[in-house]
Interface confidence: low
């Protein structure tokens, strides 16, 4: 009579985490008499998964009536699969005795577990950066299996190419993590921009996971300053404006200096927002020229988002008649802060 064969028809089985895995095994003969055992792995360190004869295996059930005398199907189902269950499973026939001895093993079925990656988390630099600078963003996703995964970076829908990605661990593992770092060059128009990390994996059925970062949390657009002298309001009074344009974020403090002495300090409050997300603001200073004998140097000094102050100066000629002075550049009235300090 032909010698018993242990047949495991599936070289590999792939199961999604949480599902049940069916591992098929049939034998070609009832002889010799003896139990079937299932193991994960081979060699002395193999792990017993199921013993037909004895033991408690709560997650394992037999697919057919393995207790019947004529049964030759020893397929099993393992419930609630997790990535930790991945490995090669062997169906092994034992010859009855004291003790039972191993008679023949099947070729093995490799169980791979498909586990979804976690939602990508995108994080940017700890400190803000100004336009033209390159900043790094990182994207992390964990817990997926198998190892093959695709990660893409986008800025406002445009795919980025300057990034480096690593999948850990390098060797075999029950699940994997991906870590990617992308470099992004900031522009003055990036206040409303988004950086997106997109992860595609076999478990996601073509619907990739995305993580986003808003560049508004990363960018600092420094202001441009313009100091202008307005037409005379009243005899001996000159109105000087400091227009602070195109800055982000809003955190801004302005100080007026007259001949180097602090005249007034104020914080940007009623600002106007530009289409690109940056802000404009204007401060007025009403100067009583009759109080000055000599020419006055007016300085608008701005400290933006904790950065070193920038300033713009305007020389006020008190010797000339006020009505003949300066430019008549029209001022934006929005966000104005008018104070007569005399």
């Amino acid at each position: 009579e032909e010698e018993l064969q242990v047949i495991q028809p599936d070289k590999s089985v792939s199961v999604a985490a949480g599902e049940s895995a069916i591992l098929h095994c049939t034998v070609t003969s009832l002889i010799p008499v003896g139990p079937i055992q299932w193991f994960r792995g081979a060699g002395p360190a193999r792990e017993l998964i199921y013993n037909q004869k004895e033991g408690h295996f709560p997650r394992v059930t037999t697919v057919s009536e393995s207790t019947k005398r004529e049964n030759m199907d020893f397929s099993i189902s393992i419930s609630n699969i997790t990535p930790a269950d991945a490995g090669t499973y062997y169906c092994v026939k034992f010859r009855k005795g004291s003790p039972d001895t191993e008679f023949k093993s099947g070729a093995g079925t490799e169980l791979s577990v498909r586990a979804k990656p976690s939602a990508p988390v995108v994080s940017g630099p700890a400190a803000r950066a100004t336009p033209q600078h390159t900043v790094s963003f990182t994207c992390e996703s964990h817990g997926f299996s198998p190892r093959d995964i695709t990660l893409k970076w986008f800025k406002n829908g445009n795919e980025l190419s300057d990034f480096q990605t690593n999948v850990d661990p390098v060797g075999e593992s029950v699940s994997y993590s991906i870590h990617s770092t992308a470099k992004v060059v900031l522009t003055r128009e990036d206040v409303h921009s988004q950086v997106i990390c997109e992860v595609a994996h076999v478990t996601l059925q073509g619907d990739p996971l995305r993580g986003t970062a808003n560049l508004s949390e990363t960018i600092r657009v420094p202001p441009t300053l313009e100091v202008t002298q307005q037409p005379v309001r009243a005899e001996n009074q000159v109105n000087v404006t400091c227009q602070v344009r195109k800055f982000y974020p809003q955190r801004l403090q302005l100080t007026w200096l007259e001949n180097g002495n602090v005249s007034r300090t104020e914080t940007a409050s009623t600002v106007t927002e530009n289409k690109d997300g940056t802000y404009n603001w204007m401060s007025w200073l009403l100067v009583n020229v009759s109080a000055h004998r000599d020419d006055v140097k007016l300085t608008c000094q701005v400290e933006h988002d904790g950065q070193p102050a920038v300033s713009k100066s305007h020389d006020l000629k008190v010797s000339a008649h006020p009505k003949e002075q300066g430019s008549n550049t029209a001022a934006e009235n929005t966000g104005s802060n008018e104070r007569n300090i005399y």
Partner: antibody, heavy 116, light 110 residues
Framework: QSVEESGGRLVTPGTPLTLTCTVS????????MHWVRQAPGKGLEWIGI?????ATSYATWAKGQFTISKTSTTVDLKITSPTTEDTATYFC?????????????WGPGTLVTVSL | QIVMTQTPFSVSAVVGGTVTIKCQAS??????LAWYQQKPGQRPKLLIY???TLASGVSSRFKGSGSGTEFTLTISGVESADAATYYC????????????FGGGTEVVVK
């Protein structure tokens, strides 16, 4: 199977230094190699790895400061611009497989002193 | 990045006693953990890998346990030759790590 480091000496800050790890009894085409250092009285600090194919990875703090390369029987660690903080015993160690996992063969170490 | 934190910094043991050293990973690293022994002036020696597997030639008095983020090295029947510094090391991954080793634990045997 053994590894041995050489090249450690007293150098002044900023002077590049190359340490060499010579292996015997196994092939670098089968095993990844690591460099680890230990400052006097301090703990072990992983510097980087060179894989069987020649690719390298470095600790975040070590990028740009160190370069790992290899020949058929040696692995080099170049300290590009040493500072006094780089004073340490430098070990090379064999990984237990091509991928990254554990260090099962270590050299005796070579001492680098960076001082003015 | 994965950070390995070892406790305590130093521990005192008596001959014949038991010492326990703990190692915590900032992320789940499964069983990818090794323990090393280093005596003063000597190279480190691999004691345990895959969290609990004894390296070749290492005494069974050394036992590793744990998985995920919490790991323990236990030395039972402490001998004077066990006086050394012990380090844990994650073998999970090396992308964007500062150090794969824990800070070390000095074992002093009285």
């Amino acid at each position: 199977q053994s590894v041995e480091e050489s090249g450690g000496r007293l150098v002044t800050p900023g002077t590049p230094l190359t340490l060499t790890c010579t292996v015997s009894g196994f092939s670098l085409s089968n095993y990844a190699m690591h460099w680890v250092r230990q400052a006097p009285g301090k703990g072990l600090e992983w510097i980087g790895i060179i894989y069987t194919g020649g690719a390298t990875s470095y600790a975040t703090w070590a990028k740009g400061q160190f370069t790992i390369s290899k020949t058929s029987t040696t692995v080099d660690l170049k300290i590009t611009s040493p500072t006094t903080e780089d004073t340490a015993t430098y070990f090379c160690a064999r990984g237990d497989r091509d991928g990254y996992a554990y260090f099962n063969i270590w050299g005796p170490g070579t001492l680098v002193t960076v001082s003015l | 990045q994965i950070v390995m934190t070892q406790t305590p910094f130093s521990v005192s043991a008596v001959v014949g006693g038991t010492v326990t050293i703990k190692c915590q990973a900032s992320h789940n690293i499964g069983s990818w953990l090794a323990w090393y022994q280093q005596k003063p002036g000597q190279r480190p020696k691999l004691l345990i890998y895959d969290a609990s597997t004894l390296a070749s030639g290492v005494s069974s008095r050394f036992k590793g346990s744990g998985s995920g983020t919490e790991f323990t090295l236990t030395i039972s029947g402490v001998e004077s030759a066990d006086a050394a510094t012990y380090y844990c090391q994650q073998g999970y991954g090396i992308s964007y790590v500062h150090n794969v080793f824990g800070g070390g634990t000095e074992v002093v045997v009285k």
